[in-house]
């Protein structure tokens, strides 16, 4: 059997591998060893006891989407029957005080490695015997505690397969210069140790996402905006932008990056290096936002000028590929999809990356201030209560809805809170009565909402003692 | 929908260079290699090169190596395939076609261009 | 390169008759190979790929098959619009290479 017997449903063309050759990754028309890695259909009836206890589930992600040449990250974390968990020999154990179907286990091992391996590779003193190989052959590396890896992973994608050995979480990063754009498929085998051989115990597969768009998310704020999440905002009042580039592996770090934003408002283009900038709308209305990120990325070198035509016959591309295939050295630039790059040149594209949006602008309430406050006295049976009046003033939309958070001094441990409808004219002056039990110094938030806007002032007062002669004061 | 559009027919004489157009539309261009392939009257097909769009690179069949250039305009969504040298032999008509992804069969063809070589 | 070698080079077949077209290639080029159909003044249209899959919209009288280096292009009931050049095409690897063409006839 070959690799793409084993790994997919059908053989991935030459041509797809030479599109999307994966440093480091081998073809996948290289022989599987199906003695040392057996090889079972989806239904076969061994699938059920490839692991004591139940099945392992293997949950793949990555980082996608990726910019075309940087690197994608995969990561596999499998996922034990309930009670079992890997511990830091590698062993798969039993987790303490916790039950299964099968009550409490006596033996504390689902699987001891450890033991297997000190028995099995005694046969020579290099520890490296002839089951310590990969499906394809190759040995496994020599990492300090390798040992204790007892995992096989093997990534399939593109035509091509890479193989790792690890522990119950493995990750795998891939350079996307030369991957094709769009969707793409990654598929996972996995294997665990059995005695001299190896068992599948999960397959796992996900889509991954190559670009050469920037992949732009921007977060918008704006203070007094009730629903920062249904782009609809308020007039006169700035809305910060906020760009997100997505890139996990910091491909662009070294770039320099440039935002063009259009508002839609006739205001015209602003270019800023700033991944954050401030517009305010001064009219009401749908307005088309528009943001461009434009980044200078490394990329391939442009072709160079075509040579003069030789005088001898140019080497086919059929002959290169073959070279390429085989594995055998060839002439710099043999890669069929190399002959137009220049070694060791650092090259630039400039990437784009675009976003946009369709805003609504509405009246809302700007601002909200206290202009007063005033002890309201009262009658001798409530001595420990006070009554305030704020005295408030608000500019923009008429408020429906008045809130009042009262709290300790530090304004976080909350003692009360009181909503009401409010009655509002033109001139948006209204007066809020509200309690404090006891004297002492008292945070106040205070908050004028409508449909779209929620505006807030704060302060701290400080609440005499009922001593007629005590005046209140605005502690702040 | 997917339109390739190509430049109208040409007649060269012997020795000198022709290039063809081919404007692409209703997908994103820079997705999927484009693809040269030629026809001479009464013949079959034969595959002259690729490009892919979004960064310039190429792979040419060894008979037109030295003589083909594809290039890219991402601007206007075009790809551009220049002829040098011609022979009468060159006469034929030229189609640029889109491969589907990693799979380099052609869903979409332009309409094809008329260059006809004759001193 | 890749040799195709498409047979026979023409065909007539009496309407509502099966047809069948054979395309050898050189090497191994399983499952990558494609069939296109052309009529005159027109570029060549998809019909099948990776041997036995049908394009969109392509109707199901067209069918593919074969492995390895043998495959056949069948039309299960020749209709007049069938009437056309065939070509087989392996996109397994560079440069992509096209059979020769087989011309399609009613009888």
């Known amino acids: 059997k070959r690799f793409h017997d084993v790994l997919g449903n059908e053989r991935p063309s030459a041509y797809m591998r030479e599109h999307n050759q994966l440093n480091g990754w081998s073809s996948d028309e290289n022989d599987w060893n199906e003695k040392l890695y057996p090889v079972w259909k989806r239904g076969d009836m061994r699938w059920k006891n490839s692991w004591k206890g139940g099945r392992v589930q293997a949950v793949l992600t990555s980082d996608s989407p990726a910019l075309v040449g940087s690197n994608i990250t995969f990561a596999v974390n499998l996922i034990f029957p309930r009670c079992q968990k890997e511990d830091a020999n590698g062993n798969i154990v039993y987790e303490k005080n916790c039950r299964n179907e099968a009550g409490l286990s006596a033996d504390p091992y689902v699987y001891n490695w450890t033991a297997w391996s000190e028995d099995s590779d005694g046969e020579n003193g290099t520890g490296q015997s002839h089951h310590n190989v990969f499906p394809d052959g190759k040995p496994f590396p020599h990492h300090p505690g390798w040992r204790r890896w007892n995992f096989i992973y093997v990534f399939h994608t593109l035509g091509q397969y890479f193989q790792k050995l690890g522990r119950c979480s493995v990750r795998v990063s891939v350079n996307t210069a030369n991957v094709t754009l769009g969707p793409q498929l990654m598929e996972v085998t996995v294997y665990r140790r059995h005695g001299r051989a190896y068992v599948p115990i999960a397959q796992v597969k996900d889509v991954y996402v190559v670009t050469d768009q920037i992949p732009v998310f921007v977060t918008m704020f704006q203070k007094n905006d009730r629903n920062s999440s249904d782009e609809t905002f308020l007039k006169d009042l700035p809305i910060m932008f906020d760009v997100l580039i997505h890139d996990p592996s910091h491909f662009l770090n070294y770039s320099t990056i440039n935002y063009k934003w259009s508002f839609g408002d006739n205001t015209g283009l602003f270019v800023s290096t700033n991944h954050t900038v401030n517009h305010t709308y001064v009219l009401n209305g749908t307005f088309s936002l528009n943001l461009t990120v434009k980044a200078a990325a490394p990329g391939p070198c442009p072709p160079p000028p075509p040579p003069p035509r030789p005088s001898k016959p140019t080497p086919s591309l059929a002959t290169t590929l073959k070279s390429y295939d085989s594995n055998t050295p060839g002439p710099a630039g043999d890669n069929p999809l190399e002959l137009s790059r220049i070694p060791d040149e650092n090259c630039q594209i400039n990437r784009y990356g675009h976003f946009q949006a369709t805003i609504t602008i509405v009246e809302g309430i700007l601002e909200v201030n206290i202009i007063q406050m005033t002890d309201v006295l009262m009658p001798v049976p409530w001595p420990e209560s006070s009554l305030i009046d704020f005295v408030v003033t608000c500019q923009g939309s008429i408020p429906t809805e008045v809130c009042t958070i009262i709290s300790d001094p530090t304004c976080e441990i909350t003692q009360n809170t009181v909503c009401s409808p409010v009655d509002v004219d033109e001139m948006c002056l209204l007066t809020v009565r509200r309690t404090f039990n006891g004297s002492g110094t008292y945070c106040v938030n205070l908050t004028l909402g409508d449909d779209t806007s929620l505006a807030l002032t704060s302060t701290l007062i400080s609440v005499p003692d009922r001593d007629p002669a005590s005046p209140l004061r605005m502690a702040n | 929908q997917v339109q390739l559009v190509q430049s109208g027919a040409e007649v060269k004489k012997p020795g000198a260079s022709v290039k063809v157009s081919c404007k692409a539309s209703?997908?994103?261009?820079?997705?999927?290699?484009m693809h040269w392939v030629r026809q001479a009257p009464g013949q079959g097909l034969e595959w002259m090169g690729e490009?892919?769009?979004?960064?310039?690179?190429?792979n040419y069949a060894q008979k037109f190596q030295g003589r083909v250039t594809m290039t890219v305009d991402k601007s206007t969504s075009t790809v551009y395939m220049e002829l040098s040298s011609l022979r009468s032999e060159d006469t034929a008509v030229y189609y640029c076609a889109r491969s589907g992804g990693n799979y380099a069969w052609f869903a979409y063809w332009g309409q094809g261009t008329l260059v006809t070589v004759s001193s | 390169d890749i040799v195709m070698t498409q047979s026979p080079d023409s065909l007539a077949v009496s309407l509502g008759e099966r047809a069948t077209i054979n395309c050898k290639a050189s090497q191994d080029v399983s499952p990558s190979l494609a069939w296109y159909q052309q009529k005159p003044g027109q570029p060549p249209k998809l019909l099948i790929y990776?041997?036995?899959y049908r394009y969109t919209g392509v109707p199901d009288r067209f069918s593919g098959s074969g492995s390895g280096t043998d495959f056949t292009l069948t039309i299960s009931s020749l209709q007049a619009e069938d009437v056309a050049v065939y070509y087989c095409q392996q996109h397994y690897s560079i440069p992509l290479t096209f059979g020769g063409g087989t011309k399609v006839e009613i009888k």
């Open positions: 490009i892919n769009p979004s960064d310039g690179r190429t």
């Open positions: 990776s041997a036995s």
């Open positions: 209703g997908y994103t261009f820079t997705s999927y290699w």
